[in-house]
Interface confidence: low
């Protein structure tokens, strides 16, 4: 008769993937089809993998996701021409542990944080074999880093200054696949290092080749010599320049730039130690060509006396205003109405005071430091009849 060997009476497994093994001897050796595994609910599993030596057949079964309800008595069954044998064994499926609370930040500096990992209470089963503190900067596409922790209080070192981090704790119980899901996430920000950036930073185009950066006067809190470092880089080209400006000045003209190009500028106040960078500011140099026509022009919401006109404009041409020109079809050129919209970020406008049942010719064009765009064609707008009063 076949014999089932090396099968313990009790197995503790972690929920998740599980590959139980049934090993049997006998003559003839059991084949793949002759070995099965029966779950507590009566489901019969067949081997996913099978090997044999001169002495044993080994059936390897795959349960892709074993869960606590699968706990109970499983049976390894071997049925050959020489006879049938069954070996029951107990499987206890454990729930992977997960902390209920996010870790707490006790203290932070510019490059460290002291954390209480708050690993208890946790959901799921113990005992906990090990604990990991996972952390990463929020705005970086970096993988989570982790450290193994033994104490509830742990210090994270080598952090970046003025950076927001995410933290969570992962608990690991004994046995293969014992890593639980990470617990709730805590966010914190490390402290700054060095002087804060200049206040009131403002970046405006001055010409086709210059931008002007201004800031509020800086009043140092110590006797240390200081200067303002300004970094400017082109968005379109990989071109960067750093300029040192004496600390008593409140502006700098960034020159030798290219027309119609977008630049990113930031500044910091340096002493012996480097200060903290400001947020990025962006601006375009003035255009060296006429602006392109507004695009996606659409006339909608037409009534007897009004209509809405909408459009989009391209970035980078120093467009300062949009003009809508309209006149009654067939009237003289000089009888038109111009509406000048000085805020180029506005992308729609309601024409009012129109005549009912009238055809209008509408033109729209953009203006920049060079001049006005040339409308390719006019748009026709016909107002509706005036509705009769009841």
């Amino acid at each position: 008769t076949p014999k089932i060997v090396d099968l313990p009476d009790h197995i503790e497994v972690n929920s998740g993937k599980f590959n139980p093994i049934c090993k049997a001897s006998g003559w003839p050796l059991p084949t793949n089809e002759e070995m099965t595994l029966v779950k507590p609910d009566g489901t019969v599993l067949h081997p996913k993998d099978f090997n044999h030596t001169d002495h044993f057949s080994v059936a390897i079964f795959t349960i892709h996701r074993i869960l606590p309800p699968d706990s109970g008595v499983w049976v390894c069954s071997v049925n050959t021409v020489a006879g049938m044998v069954e070996k029951p064994f107990n499987i206890s499926v454990k729930v992977l542990p997960k902390p209920l609370n996010a870790p707490n930040v006790i203290d932070t500096g510019h490059n460290f944080a002291v954390i209480n990992i708050s690993s208890e209470p946790y959901f799921g089963d113990g005992p906990i074999k090990s604990k990991k503190l996972l952390y990463k900067p929020v705005n970086h596409y970096e993988a989570w880093q982790h450290i193994q922790v033994t104490n509830e209080i742990v210090t994270l070192n080598y952090l970046e200054p003025r950076t927001e981090y995410e933290l969570c704790v992962q608990l690991v119980r004994r046995g293969e696949g014992g890593e639980g899901h990470p617990g709730p996430v805590r966010r914190f920000t490390t402290a700054s290092i060095g002087l804060p950036p200049p206040r009131g930073l403002n970046l405006l185009p001055k010409s086709q080749t210059t931008l002007n950066l201004t800031w509020q006067p800086i009043f140092p809190s110590s006797e240390d010599d200081f200067y303002v470092e300004v970094e400017r880089r082109s968005v379109q080209k990989s071109d960067q320049q750093n300029i040192k400006v004496p600390g008593n000045l409140t502006s700098v003209l960034l020159n030798n730039l290219h027309p119609r190009e977008q630049y990113v500028v930031r500044a910091r106040v340096n002493t012996k130690a480097q200060g903290e960078w400001s947020e990025d500011l962006t601006a375009w140099t003035l255009s060296d060509i006429l602006p392109p026509q507004p695009e996606n022009i659409k006339i909608s919401n037409i009534t007897h006396s009004s209509a809405v006109i909408s459009w989009t404009i391209l970035d980078g041409y120093s467009i300062s205003s949009i003009t809508i020109r309209y006149k009654v079809q067939g009237k003289n050129e000089d009888q038109h109405v111009d509406v000048k919209i000085k805020n180029a970020t506005i992308t729609q406008y309601q024409l009012k005071g129109l005549e009912p049942e009238t055809a209008y010719q509408v033109d729209i064009f953009a203006e920049n430091n060079i001049g006005s765009s040339n409308p390719a064609f006019s748009h026709e707008l016909v107002t509706l009849p005036e509705s009769q009063a009841p």
């Epitope: 090396d6 313990p8 090993k23 030596t53 044993f56 993988a143 293969e176």
Partner: antibody, heavy 115, light 107 residues
Framework: QVQLQQPGAELVRPGASVKLSCKAS????????MNWVKQRPGQGLEWIGM????????RLNQKFKDKATLTVDKSSSTAYLQLSSPTSEDSAVYYC????????WGQGTTLTVSS | DIQMTQSPSSLSASLGERVSLTCRAS??????LNWLQQEPDGTIKRLIY???ILDSGVPKRFSGSRSGSDYSLTISSLESEDFVDYYC?????????FGGGTKLEIK
């Protein structure tokens, strides 16, 4: 048949990061863990860690957590081991091996850290 | 971490002789143990997995067994190509750990 191809040797200067490769063929690359193992001259074998190419889940031996970074390129079925700030202690043969059961091994890359 | 203590570290034997190498696990690893063979040129090949299952193409003179926490690799009749290095490897609990190795030398 299953094959793991590794370059025979790499020379790197101390402190300069190095990336070792392991190109897999003959099986579904995204279905098996890929292990990395270190062997110093005249010494035994030491497990560095493993990565699952399907989702880049990584398990590292704590001893190597600040030293090794494991990555994969699914499009070329290649696994990589990057060693940061190498020193003479990192001069060794580095093997890749397939799966939880280490059923197939690469030939190993001999890394020499020397100025 | 689970320690795998492999013995002997070196062994001199004659052609045709029967030898056994042993690995002792510091914790329960079930049958999660491989035996590996390393050639002088560094090539590593798995001989046995799950304690006793022979890899395909591995000669039948190799066998694996277990007694409690002791795991053995037995070569029933040594041939000239068997005089190389052998390692055990446990894969029951991460980090996976290797035995220190056994150098099998010809007497």
């Amino acid at each position: 048949q299953v094959q793991l191809q590794q370059p025979g040797a790499e020379l790197v200067r101390p402190g300069a990061s190095v990336k070792l490769s392991c190109k897999a063929s003959g099986y579904s690359f995204t279905s098996y863990w890929m292990n990395w193992v270190k062997q110093r001259p005249g010494q035994g074998l030491e497990w560095i860690g493993m990565i699952h190419p399907s989702d880049s889940e990584t398990r590292l031996n704590q001893k190597f957590k600040d030293k090794a970074t494991l990555t994969v390129d699914k499009s070329s079925s290649t696994a990589y081991l990057q060693l940061s700030s190498p020193t003479s202690e990192d001069s060794a043969v580095y093997y890749c091996a397939r799966g939880n059961y280490f059923d197939c091994w690469g030939q190993g890359t001999t890394l020499t850290v020397s100025s | 971490d689970i320690q795998m203590t492999q013995s002997p570290s070196s062994l001199s034997a004659s052609l045709g002789e029967r030898v056994s190498l042993t690995c002792r696990a510091s914790q329960d690893i079930g049958i999660s143990l491989n035996w590996l063979q390393q050639e002088p040129d560094g090539t590593i090949k798995r001989l046995i997995y799950a304690t006793s299952i022979l890899d395909s193409g591995v000669p039948k003179r190799f066998s694996g067994s277990r007694s409690g926490s002791d795991y053995s690799l037995t070569i029933s009749s040594l041939e000239s190509e068997d005089f190389v290095d052998y390692y055990c490897l446990q894969y029951a609990s991460s980090p996976w750990t290797f035995g220190g190795g056994t150098k099998l030398e010809i007497k």
